[in-house]
Structure formats: structure tokens, C-alpha cells
């Protein structure tokens, strides 16, 4: 498939309003067609032409002037004015405010918990899995195997630290060099970035804020990916991570600290340790090939024990095999040995869900990740809700300039690095990227936080995730001090050399624009967001990781093939996009193409046809429920949980409205969908009394 | 209590073979080892062999090996010495003994079997 | 095999006195050893074993100490019961193999 989701030169048609043509249209909307249907804050509702209700691709007819989807949308605050209340109106107003706050924090508290389930839920369904990942012993030779690895790993227990624990107790027992960690490391470091990827998916339901808060979470997807794709060749060829990380370990005489501040943790735990418990040892033990470990259950049933090391006697073969000449005895027949073991008597059973139910760690995993995401997506719902009904007007103008505006001139590029500073603060406040960098994905869904500001927040995060496992590997125990704090180095220095490849020069934000660039594309097919999450997160690295196993030469004889037509393309369009002449006519653009190779459209009707019926059912499903939650907020008008629903009633409503024909989407370029030419936002009713 | 009950005294001629008994009674027999000890007149103790009435393994001292053989019956809970090509040197009292578990001590001793080798 | 040399062959003592009773082994034997007590005419007794523990029924004024090669038997006060022949054992390795015998008589 060619790099972008359509390619072509062909103009649109000028006679259609489409969803993607931004630019300036030659006739204005047919006034016939425009309603003054109104929601809850009596602003016209401009009537959209439906395609079939299940198309994922909704035709807009769009006003004249041009909007940059990427421009934060201005939130209208349709209440009183403080000013204009009355002292009853005022309290009530503070009350309000308040209990707002409350229920923000709480559904935080409770968002942050879900992320904390979600990854003992993908413990449990992936983690022995991904332990015997680690078993694989090509990873010591192949950098690239230890990179989807790491990539794996940490996508299966949804937890960088769980698999850099690994790396570190597996570098302490000799199992694994540094060298053969570094890649690990960094595929960790990619598998991290899947989290508030999730988080953004559940923002699916409103177009403009799924853009935006998909591209604020892939923004650190691609800046992972793109510093894997320049470091570990460069790691690969001057080792210049282990060689920096190895001089720093041994030019300082490091003592053993404390253990890194649980913040976050301690308001978290009570809650989620009454859901369930994990003895993460497990995976570990699995990583280091320990056979009894492989039948050991993940949940944790005793959670108060007693060690006691005693010495048995022990029969063996011969005196060569005791313990020592001193402890070596016969009974006249056997040779005996006093062996050294630790006898564990369980006192005190966990006290969590899961405890009796004895049930196999799949069952478990597959019900808390069910039920994490459930409470994660609506936890997510009623916290852009909330942000919404706060951030309007004054307020919301308020906090956007004070976080995306820059210092004054000649200081205005230090505001990145202060962000960077912020970002690494904040996560070593929560001690996790993840749970920041997913607070941060609703936030520039909503429009609060632009992507160019979150990018180095972003940036500030992977770097604060590495403080802390550095301030954890100088809690290790003596034996494991070294290997930890080497790698927690490692770890350290490759985001900041990442931040040094993709973020000092304006022009190297890669990142920014390819994070961008999969906004406008998911906004329009949304289903693509999921395929780029399955296809990056999941295949390519089990693809790399199957031909890895087959050998060398297959990997070399697939991927160089694969890496030659990638490189081949990118020249291609960077040719066509700069110098277009160079090329012979039939290169100048991708009609040459058959259509499915060259846009995504074949595709959405494929995709369509399955989801459609689906999507009406759980349309219906959602309304109902819509409605049975706007009776119980007391609602004017019935709220409406997403763009799908919406589309379903207005189709129901206005029965009138000629649908467009699908054959209106035959031209439209890659030019216009990869730059965003899309609504910049949908219709969206609020339920104010919130 | 814990017994071990001998054969009776035994008058042999050299190069002849004697067979003599230790029954136990008291405890499992097939969960300890049992010994067997010779003591000449006068003189110390030797230790001969041993055998596990559980499975049948048998070890000895290279000195009686061949000369010695033990058999344990686990029916009757009885152990069993029959030394063969007795010499006058074999004439001395024998002893069985239970070895404790998991180790080589000897906590309790038959009364002892007295043999002579006498042409 | 291991040797187990006993001294003193013969112990003269009196009712009331502290006797020891040295057992050197040819190698280190750890604690693999076991003391015996044998009356005349009568079959041997399990007194202690590794080196120091006393078997059941054992009167305390019996103890051992020592381990590796040099091992001590101490009776803390001689009873006229005591009068008998006392072995050393190892049982570190096979064959087992006792000490000479130390007797102990009234003087």
C-alpha cells in the first residue's frame, strides 16, 4: 500500500461539499437545506448530508471560510455570567464548581486505577507469554529480535518497568549481556506508547477531538519508533549507550539508595489491591527459564507468609555431590548432604476479588480487561464531560494561554524545555509515563493542550519514567546495582539522545507531523486507528520475531526486499510532493495504482459492510442508555454519547435529507486528507446540568 | 519399644556357612537401615555392612564382601546374615543393629549372635 | 577408610569424677560421629550422636563436642553405672568405623 491512504492528483469535484475539501468552495451551501435545529445551547446545528448511517466516512456540507482542524476550538461558555447572577445563583454556582472538582478528581482517581487493572489484566492474559519471550536465547545476537521483544513484552504486561525488571534480573544472573538488553530496552520503550493510544481511542466518538487526541498519543509512538529507527543502528554499529552507561557505572561509587517515592501508588494501591493482586515474580522466573514457575498462578493468593530457612538432609548420589566434605555423612547405604531450604508457610490470604475463586489467570485477565477498559473509557467520558462544562469561555481562554503560549522574545524557545522539565517532573511525581501521558491524551482531545506543546511534555515523560528507574536501580541489592543502574542509564540516554534527534530544530518534529498526518487519516476512517494500532504494536513485531526464528537469512531475505520498496516509495513521494518533473509522467502521481493500493477507500467500504450492522446495534444500545442518563442529570434535551448515534437520529429525523452518493468520494487526493482538510469539528450536544 | 531379637549360638566348622536371624519387632521395618557389627573376642567393634529392608540395597565393607551377604524378608520383618568359607577369624559375636534415619548411628542393637569356628 | 584412633585405651576413675575421652579422626568427618557404651556381656548403647546430641533417654551428665577431626566424650561425674567400654563411630563415610575402645574402670 502507498504511504499515504489516498494518492492522486485528480481535483475534487467542485459542484460537492465533501468531507476533506477544505479548500475554498466555488458555490455556498444550499440555504434549503439548513435547519435551525437547535440543541441545549441554542447554537445552529449546520444539517449534514448523511451517507448510510454506517459508513465511517461522513460527507459535511462545510460554511465558506477555511478552518485548520489542528486550530484549538474556541469553547463557548453558554452559561450566566457571575456578574449577572444572584447571591443564590452565585452559591449554587460555587457549589456546583465544587462538586464538579469532586467528581473530576474522582473520576481521575478512578481513571488512573483502571490504567493500574489494565495492565495486571494484560499480565495475566499475556504475561507468562511474554516471559518466555525472554527465554529466547537468539536475543544475545540479534538486536532486532530484542527490539520486538521489548516492543511485545511490554505491550503484553502494558508495563515498562515489568519488562526492564526482567532485562535487570536476567543481566544480574548472566543471562543476558547489557548489550543484548540495550534493544530490549528500547523496544520497551515503544510498547510503553500503546497505553494512551487506548486512552485516545476512546475518544472515537466526536471526529475533530479524536484527531486531535490521536495525534497528541501517537505523537509519542513516532518519536519512539523514529529514535529506534537512527539509534539502534547507531547502538548496533559504536555501542556508544553501553560504552557511555559502562563509564558512568564505573567512575562512580554508588552506594545503595532508597527506593524511588511512591506518590501516585499509595492513593492507588488501597483500591486497586481490592481488585486483584500479582506476584510479578512469575514472569520473571518464567524470562529465566524456571520450569516450576510455568504452572505458577499469576494472582496472588497469600499474602502474608513466613519463610523459614532450615537445613534438610538430603540423600545424593555421591560424596562429590555434597554440600561440603564437612556436610557429607553416610546411613551405611546412601551418601547424605544437609541442603539449605526455605520452607514457606502461608498465614494470611490476600484479601481481593479473585482470591477464592481459583479461576485460571486467562478467566481473570479477560474480566479485568474487559471491566478496566469499561471503567477506563467511561471514566474518560465523564472526564472530558466535566472538562467541558470548566473549560468554557474566560476559564478555558485562561489555562490554554498559560500552557500553549510561549515565553516572550528572546526566550520563546526555552518553553519547550521548561515542558520537557514539567513532563519529567509530572511522571516522576505519578512514577509512570503511561498514566501521565493518558491524563495528558483527553486534554488535547478536548482542545486544552495543542499537540505542539504536549510533544514535549511528552518528551519530559519518557525522561521522567528513566529517573525513576534509576533512583529504583540505586535501591537495588548489591549484586543487582550495577546491571540495573547501567541499564536505567541506557534507558536514560536513549530518550535524551531521541529528544536531541527530534526535538531542538523546528524542522526535525517529525514526529509532530507524522502524528498529525494519522489524526487526519483516523478522523475520517476511524477504524484505521485500530488497524495502526494491531498493525505497529502487534504484527510487525511478531512478523520480525517469526522470521528472526527462522534465522538471519530469512529475516535478511524479507526484510531487505520490504525495507528497499519503503525507502523506494518515500523517495517516490518526496519527488512528487518537490520536484514533480524529474519524474517521467506516469510517476508524477500514484494513479498508476490500482485503487486499493493507493487509498483507503476500497477498504472503508470493506470495513463498512462488517461494522455496519454492529455499529446500529450498539447505536441503539448507547441511545437508550444516553437517555437513561440525561433523565438522571435532568437534560433539556437528550445528550447523545457519539457522532454514530448522533448521525443514526439525524437520519431518523430528517428523513428528507438527500444522502450523497457514495461516487462522490472517487477523487479525493491523498493531498487533502493527509493535510487535514476535514471538518474541524462536529455537532455535539452538552449536557450542562453535569 | 523398639526390638531386635538374634538367632541362637552357632558352632561351625571351617569353611562351612552359617545363617543367622534378627527379627524386629516395634517399629517399620522397611523404613530403617539395618546394620550388621562383628566383635571378635577382646576387641572392637568392626562394621560389616548394611541393607535396606525397603528396596533390598545392600553396601559393605570391602573386607566381607563376597564373605557376607544380607537378605531382609519384609514379611516377617526379619533380617538375615549367612557368612560362607568361614575361618577361625570369623569366630566372634555378631551383632544387628538399627541404623537411625538418614544417618549412620546405631540406636538399637540385638543381643547378638556368637558363632564359633571350630574344627 | 577413615581411622578412628581413641584415647586413653584405659581410664581409671572414681565416683564423682570428670572424665573425657579424645576420638581423632584420619580426616574431617564434619559431625558424623556417634559414641557408644558397652557393658560386659551385653550388646553396645547409643549415647550421643552428631558429635554432640544426646539420644533419647541419655542422662545428661553424657556429652560431646568437637568436630572435623578431634572429638571429646565427657562424663561430668562418674556413676558406678558408668563403668563399662566406650567407642567412638564416624559415619561420615562408608565403611563405618569405630574406635579401639576406651574402658573405663572404678579405681
Known amino acids: 500500500m502507498a504511504p499515504w491512504p489516498e494518492l492522486g492528483d485528480a481535483q475534487p469535484n467542485p459542484d460537492k461539499y465533501l468531507e476533506g475539501a477544505a479548500g475554498q468552495q466555488p458555490t455556498a451551501p444550499d440555504k434549503s437545506k439548513e435547519t435551525n435545529k437547535t440543541d441545549n445551547t441554542e447554537a445552529p446545528v449546520t444539517k449534514i448530508e448523511l451517507l448510510p448511517s454506517y459508513s465511517t466516512a461522513t460527507l459535511i456540507d462545510e460554511p465558506t471560510e477555511v478552518d485548520d482542524p489542528w486550530n484549538l476550538p474556541t469553547l463557548q461558555d453558554s452559561g450566566i455570567k457571575w456578574s449577572e447572577r444572584d447571591t443564590k445563583g452565585k452559591i449554587l454556582c460555587f457549589f456546583q464548581g465544587i462538586g464538579r472538582l469532586i467528581l473530576l478528581l474522582g473520576f481521575l482517581y478512578f481513571f488512573v486505577c483502571s490504567l493500574d487493572i489494565l495492565s495486571s489484566a494484560f499480565q495475566l492474559v499475556g504475561g507468562k507469554m511474554a516471559g518466555q519471550f525472554f527465554s529466547n536465547s537468539s536475543i544475545m545476537s540479534n538486536p532486532l529480535l530484542g527490539l520486538v521483544i521489548g516492543v511485545l513484552v511490554t505491550v503484553l504486561v502494558q508495563s515498562s518497568s515489568t519488562s526492564t525488571s526482567i532485562v535487570v534480573s536476567m543481566v544480574s544472573s548472566s543471562l543476558l549481556t547489557v548489550r543484548a538488553a540495550i534493544p530490549i530496552i528500547m523496544g520497551a520503550n515503544i510498547g510503553t506508547s500503546i497505553t494512551n493510544t487506548i486512552v485516545a481511542l476512546m475518544q472515537v466518538g466526536d471526529r475533530s477531538e479524536f484527531r486531535r487526541a490521536f495525534a497528541g498519543a501517537t505523537v509519542h509512538d513516532f518519536f519512539n519508533w523514529l529514535s529506534v529507527l537512527v539509534l539502534l543502528p547507531v547502538e548496533v554499529a559504536t555501542h556508544y549507550l553501553e560504552i557511555i552507561t559502562q563509564l558512568i557505572v564505573e567512575s562512580f561509587h554508588f552506594k545503595n539508595g532508597e527506593d524511588a517515592p511512591d506518590l501516585l501508588k499509595v492513593i492507588t494501591k488501597p483500591f486497586t489491591k481490592l481488585i486483584v493482586q500479582l506476584d510479578k515474580k512469575v514472569i520473571s522466573q518464567i524470562a529465566m527459564n524456571d520450569e516450576k514457575a510455568k504452572n505458577k498462578s499469576l494472582v496472588k493468593i497469600w499474602c502474608k507468609t513466613f519463610t523459614n530457612k532450615t537445613q534438610i538432609n538430603v540423600t545424593v548420589p555421591s560424596t562429590a555431590n555434597c554440600t561440603s566434605p564437612s556436610l557429607c555423612w553416610t546411613d551405611g547405604i546412601q551418601n547424605w548432604t544437609m541442603k539449605n531450604v526455605t520452607y514457606k508457610e502461608n498465614i494470611a490470604k490476600c484479601q481481593h476479588i479473585f482470591v477464592n475463586f481459583h479461576l485460571p489467570d486467562l478467566a481473570v485477565g479477560t474480566i479485568l480487561l474487559i471491566l478496566s477498559l469499561l471503567v477506563l473509557c467511561g471514566c474518560l467520558i465523564m472526564i472530558v464531560k466535566i472538562l467541558g462544562s470548566v473549560l468554557k469561555g474566560q476559564v478555558a481562554t485562561v489555562i490554554k494561554k498559560t500552557i500553549n503560549t510561549d515565553f516572550p522574545f528572546p526566550f520563546a524557545w526555552l518553553t519547550g524545555y521548561l515542558a520537557i522539565l514539567v513532563g519529567a517532573g509530572m511522571t516522576f511525581i505519578v512514577q509512570s509515563s503511561s498514566v501521565f501521558t493518558s491524563a495528558l491524551t483527553p486534554l488535547i482531545g478536548i482542545g486544552v493542550i495543542t499537540i505542539e506543546r504536549a510533544y514535549p511534555l511528552t518528551l519530559g515523560s519518557n525522561i521522567g519514567t528513566t529517573t525513576t528507574a534509576i533512583l529504583a536501580a540505586l535501591a537495588s541489592p548489591g549484586n543487582a546495582l550495577r546491571s540495573s543502574l547501567q541499564i536505567a542509564l541506557c534507558h536514560f540516554f536513549f530518550n535524551i539522545s531521541g529528544i536531541l534527534l527530534w526535538y531542538p530544530i523546528p524542522f526535525t518534529r517529525l514526529p509532530i507531523r507524522m502524528a498529525k498526518g494519522l489524526g487526519n487519516i483516523s478522523a475520517k476512517y476511524r477504524w484505521f486507528a485500530v488497524f495502526y494500532l494491531i498493525i505497529f504494536f502487534f504484527l510487525i513485531p511478531l512478523t520480525v520475531f517469526g522470521l528472526s526464528l527462522a534465522g538471519w537469512r530469512v529475516l535478511v531475505g524479507v526484510g531487505v526486499p520490504v525495507v528497499f520498496i519503503i525507502i523506494l516509495v518515500l523517495c517516490l513521494r518526496l519527488l512528487q510532493s518537490r520536484c514533480p518533473r524529474v519524474l517521467p509522467k506516469k510517476l508524477q502521481n500514484w494513479n498508476f495504482l490500482p485503487l486499493w493500493m493507493r487509498s483507503l477507500k476500497p477498504w472503508d467500504a470493506v470495513v463498512s459492510k462488517f461494522t455496519g450492522c454492529f455499529q446500529m446495534r450498539c447505536c441503539c444500545c448507547c441511545r437508550v442508555c444516553c437517555r437513561a442518563c440525561c433523565l438522571l442529570c435532568d437534560c433539556p434535551k437528550c445528550c447523545r454519547c457519539s457522532k454514530c448515534c448522533e448521525d443514526l437520529e439525524e437520519a431518523q429525523e430528517g428523513q428528507d435529507v438527500p444522502v450523497k452518493a457514495p461516487e462522490t468520494f472517487d477523487n479525493i487526493t491523498i493531498s487533502r486528507e493527509a493535510q487535514g482538510e476535514v471538518p474541524a469539528s462536529d455537532s455535539k450536544t452538552e449536557c450542562t446540568a453535569l | 519399644q523398639v526390638q531386635l531379637v538374634q538367632s541362637g549360638a552357632e558352632v561351625v566348622k571351617p569353611g562351612a556357612s552359617v545363617k543367622m536371624s534378627c527379627k524386629t519387632s516395634?517399629?517399620?521395618?522397611?523404613?530403617?537401615?539395618m546394620h550388621w557389627v562383628k566383635q571378635a573376642p577382646g576387641q572392637g567393634l568392626e562394621w560389616i555392612g548394611a541393607?535396606?529392608?525397603?528396596?533390598?540395597?545392600?553396601a559393605y565393607n570391602q573386607k566381607f564382601k563376597g564373605r557376607a551377604t544380607l537378605t531382609a524378608d519384609k514379611s516377617t520383618s526379619t533380617a538375615y546374615m549367612e557368612l560362607s568359607s568361614l575361618r577361625s577369624e570369623a569366630t566372634a559375636v555378631y551383632y544387628c543393629?538399627?541404623?537411625?534415619?538418614?544417618?549412620?548411628?546405631?540406636?538399637?542393637w540385638g543381643q547378638g549372635t556368637s558363632v564359633t569356628v571350630s574344627s | 577408610d577413615i581411622q578412628m584412633t581413641q584415647s586413653p585405651s584405659f581410664l581409671s576413675a572414681s565416683v564423682g569424677d570428670r572424665v573425657t575421652i579424645t576420638c581423632k579422626a584420619s580426616q574431617d568427618v564434619g559431625t558424623a560421629v556417634a559414641w557408644y557404651q558397652q557393658k560386659p556381656g551385653k550388646s553396645p548403647k547409643l549415647l550421643i550422636y552428631w558429635a554432640t546430641t544426646r539420644h533419647s533417654g541419655v542422662p545428661d551428665r553424657f556429652s560431646g563436642s568437637g568436630s572435623g577431626t578431634e572429638f571429646i566424650f565427657t562424663i561430668s561425674s562418674v556413676q558406678p553405672e558408668d563403668f563399662a567400654t566406650y567407642f567412638c563411630q564416624q559415619y561420615s563415610s562408608n565403611p563405618l568405623t569405630f574406635g579401639a575402645g576406651t574402658k573405663l574402670e572404678i579405681k
Open positions: 543393629a538399627r541404623g537411625m534415619y538418614g544417618h549412620g548411628a546405631m540406636d538399637y
Open positions: 541393607i535396606y529392608p525397603g528396596s533390598g540395597a545392600t
Open positions: 516395634g517399629y517399620t521395618f522397611t523404613t530403617n537401615n
